[in-house]
């Protein structure tokens, strides 16, 4: 069965900054990720960034950065402006659209004992779903 | 290079079922979806519907909605549309066109077939 | 479903002339916006996406601009092989919707 694997870290340089990775644990080949916070793609979550293989990554505020770093992982780079660092309590969801294995979404979120530089797990959060 | 090559010109009679092919080539089929497009004789284009490669999943234009259906064989990197129960103001030139596998980014249409003629008579 | 009006229906000008062809969507549709040309008897080719953004291969005497609801398409120097028809479409919500296609001719 594919996985999808978030983690959410903080950066340690600047409190302000976040780091979203996500990966796909499967044999399929990505056609295409969304990363979503808030919640799950079109249940209740808000857009940050779009990735297509060829076509290219499309963002929206606060992303600050969207990147395949393999053929199957994907980092996004957040820039809190706000005083109250709202990022640290937020879910953040990739979804993977993979042939032959379809969508698998997973959320995952800064552990609420985070220090600066350190990371939440690379596993999958029980919310895995297939459409 | 990137193309889609369509099946050849269709005369068909009022009721009866046409189906086109389109084979992709030159990239991977199963990144992006195809799209079709028809355009009557004289007239504008008027999206028909689409299908993401990846997962079979289809959108179909509401007016369209019961006599359409979109299929791809990723084997052969081929997609198909069938339309049923055919009129007299289908006649038209049928496009597949490459694009997103959402419609919702990225989605502009390159390349496009180069048109299979269907024509509807009695 | 978003309409898309695109005017006008068709225009004749002279070699080198600049040639401005407008769209208004019924609703916004941020950029997603693209321009085609399609010349007699072939099939449409992508000119420019995302309303601004030039395709590849694609000379850089046409452009595009707009956001929302209006968009605008400009030949700077319009060229013999220009002669052809011209159709934005919208991607912002499904249906999938064109404009009604603009007539290009040298006069």
């Known amino acids: 069965t594919p996985e999808v694997w978030v983690q959410v870290q903080m950066e340690a340089t600047e409190l302000s900054s976040f780091t979203v990775h996500c990966g796909f644990l499967g044999p399929g080949s990505i056609s295409l990720v969304t990363v979503s916070w808030g919640g799950p793609d079109g249940a209740g979550g808000t857009k940050l960034a779009v990735l297509h293989p060829e076509l290219g990554t499309r963002q929206w505020a606060p992303a600050r950065q969207a990147r395949w770093e393999t053929q199957s992982s994907i980092s996004l780079a957040l820039e809190d402006s706000g005083a109250s660092s709202p990022f640290a309590n937020t879910t953040f969801c990739c979804k993977f659209a993979s042939f032959p294995e379809g969508s698998w979404e997973s959320c995952g979120s800064l552990p609420p004992s985070s220090d600066p530089g350190l990371s939440a797990p690379p596993t999958p959060v029980p919310i895995l779903r297939a459409d | 290079q990137v193309q889609l090559v369509q099946s050849g010109a269709e005369v068909k009679k009022p009721g009866a079922s046409v189906k086109v092919s389109c084979k992709a080539s030159?990239?991977?089929?199963?990144?992006?979806?195809i799209y079709w497009v028809r355009q009557a004789p004289g007239q504008g284009l008027e999206w028909m519907g689409h299908?993401?490669?990846?997962?079979?999943?289809?959108d179909y234009a509401q007016k369209l909605q019961g006599r359409v259906t979109m299929t791809t064989d990723t084997s052969t990197s081929t997609a198909y549309m069938e339309l049923r129960s055919l009129r007299s103001d289908d006649t038209a030139v049928y496009y597949c066109a490459r694009g997103s596998p959402t419609y919702e980014h990225f989605n502009w249409f390159d390349p496009w077939g180069q048109g299979t003629l269907v024509t509807v008579s009695s | 479903d978003i309409q898309m009006t695109q005017s006008p229906s068709s225009l004749s000008a002279s070699v080198g002339d600049r040639v401005t062809i407008t769209c208004q969507a019924s609703d916004d549709i941020s950029d997603y916006l693209n321009w085609y040309q399609q010349k007699p008897g072939k099939a449409p080719k992508l000119l420019i996406y995302d309303a601004s953004s030039l395709h590849t291969g694609v000379p850089s005497r046409f452009s595009g601009s707009g956001s929302g609801t209006d968009f605008t398409f400009t030949i700077s120097s319009l060229q013999p092989e220009d002669i052809a028809t011209y159709y934005c479409q919208q991607y912002g919500n499904l249906p999938i919707t064109f404009g009604g296609g603009t007539k290009v001719e040298i006069k």
């Open positions: 299908i993401y490669a990846y997962s079979g999943d289809t």
């Open positions: 030159g990239y991977t089929f199963t990144h992006y979806g």
